[in-house]
């Protein structure tokens, strides 16, 4: 009978049928099984024996189907680099980290390695909302019409101008991108030194 068609099996063109779960072993010129996530190769394959896999020890992992002879060491999220943990390491997955609140990823090598503080957005602007928090530095955009933001902050949002009439008041001074509308009691005149404040 011809050599079998389940791993280990002969491969003349150095490719295997299931690229995810098999690999070409060049010394024996055969296709062998990879080890599933959470395991590693404890005995290499040959023409007479398929790969033998063993479970990763505690505090180690392998994320993919592999033919590694060791598991990768779990690494904590480094707070000095501005990272925090969102999911612990398991035998099948490395520790999941993200940038701490108020920070963004400044260095990326397959994953974030270093976070920095988000830049402040000046009064009259706010940080443009991103698909993924912590992915990039703030891009400040002006408050849209009818809104204001009066601090230098990385996270403050533009708020709608107060509508004086909703509070039974009248407008003393219109709102700007950097300040709210100033309202006054309809019966009281606004003293000059109280300009830019709300009087009840």
């Amino acid at each position: 009978s011809q050599p079998q068609a389940v791993p280990p099996y002969a491969s003349e063109n150095q490719t295997c049928r299931d690229q995810e779960k098999e690999y070409y072993e060049p010394q024996h010129r055969i296709c062998c099984s990879r080890c599933p996530p959470g395991t590693y190769v404890s005995a290499k394959c040959s023409r007479i024996r398929d790969t033998v896999c063993a479970t990763c020890a505690e505090n180690s992992y392998n994320e993919h189907w592999n033919y590694l002879t060791i598991c990768q060491l779990c690494r904590p999220c480094d707070p000095v680099m501005g990272l925090e943990e969102i999911a612990p390491c398991t035998s099948k997955r490395k520790t999941q980290c993200r940038c701490q609140p108020g920070m963004f990823c400044a260095a990326w090598a397959l994953e974030c390695t270093h976070c920095e503080l988000l830049s402040d957005c000046p009064p009259g602007t706010e940080a443009e909302l991103k698909d993924e928090v912590g992915k990039g530095n703030n891009h400040c955009v002006p408050c849209k019409a009818g809104h204001f933001q009066n601090t230098s902050s990385p996270s403050a949002r533009c708020q709608p101008h107060t509508r004086c009439e909703n509070q039974g008041l009248v407008e003393a001074a219109p709102g700007t991108a950097q300040s709210d509308t100033t309202c006054k009691n309809p019966l009281e005149p606004l003293p000059p030194e109280m300009s830019g404040t709300m009087l009840m």
């Epitope: 011809q2 050599p3 003349e12 060049p26 010394q27 024996h28 010129r29 040959s46 023409r47 007479i48």
Partner: antibody, heavy 120, light 107 residues
Framework: EVQLVESGGGLVKPGGSLRLSCAAS????????MYWFRQTPGKGLEWVAT????????YYPDSVKGRFTISRDNAKNSLYLQMSSLRAEDTAMYYC?????????????WGQGTTVTVSS | DIKMTQSPSSLSASVGDRVTITCKAG??????LSWYQQKPWKAPKILIY???RLADGVPSRFSGSGSGQDYTLTISSLQPEDFATYYC?????????FGGGTKLEIK
């Protein structure tokens, strides 16, 4: 006709070096894995080294690992074995061998051999 | 390493005799076994591969059998040119290992 012709054997002192060559003809050399085997009266036949068809992969038994290096030049249809830190136990007849390139992995052609003697 | 135990180490026989040489592997080698003939001062020559298959140009009086750990080379009717040394080789798992050889001599 497939031919494998070894050369480069000789007498060398312990600790010395020697380079064996094998000239291949009569087949598409670059399609085949090539091997060196050796034969001694004491230990019989022994595998020494393997090189893949393109030369990317090389393999050795523990007995020669770190001392012997197999290489090939597909443009010249030539196989080589660089031997260093030679020991008395490396004294043997060295054969250049072709592994068939189908699914059965046997050694279908052997050269006539070249003799290596390691002695002071 | 897989140990290959070949027996007998030597054998005397006559032309026309039926001769059997055996090789026992230290573990199941799944038929990755070949047999070689070697004459004095010559290179080994392939006879049988994958335990039972006759190599090109080899006379049909040579045959191979066996599976698992146990393998046999049979010469059905010895010819004068068959007096030589015979080796088995396992190539199922690196490092490839040979039997110690069987020297077949004229009785």
């Amino acid at each position: 006709e497939v031919q494998l012709v070894e050369s480069g054997g000789g007498l060398v002192k312990p600790g010395g070096s020697l380079r064996l060559s094998c000239a291949a003809s009569g087949f598409t050399f670059s399609d085949y894995y090539m091997y060196w085997f050796r034969q001694t009266p004491g230990k019989g036949l022994e595998w020494v080294a393997t090189i893949s068809d393109g030369g990317s992969y090389t393999y050795y038994p523990d007995s020669v690992k770190g001392r012997f290096t197999i290489s090939r030049d597909n443009a010249k249809n030539s196989l080589y074995l660089q031997m260093s830190s030679l020991r008395a136990e490396d004294t043997a007849m060295y054969y250049c061998v072709r592994e068939e390139n189908g699914n059965f992995y046997y050694f279908d052609y052997w050269g006539q051999g070249t003799t290596v003697t390691v002695s002071s | 390493d897989i140990k290959m135990t070949q027996s007998p180490s030597s054998l005397s026989a006559s032309v026309g005799d039926r001769v059997t040489i055996t090789c026992k592997a230290g573990q199941d080698i799944k038929s990755y076994l070949s047999w070689y003939q070697q004459k004095p001062w010559k290179a080994p020559k392939i006879l049988i591969y994958y335990a039972t298959r006759l190599a090109d140009g080899v006379p049909s009086r040579f045959s191979g059998s066996g599976s698992g750990q146990d393998y046999t080379l049979t010469i059905s009717s010895l010819q004068p040119e068959d007096f030589a040394t015979y080796y088995c080789l396992q190539h199922g798992e690196s490092p490839w290992t040979f039997g110690g050889g069987t020297k077949l001599e004229i009785k």
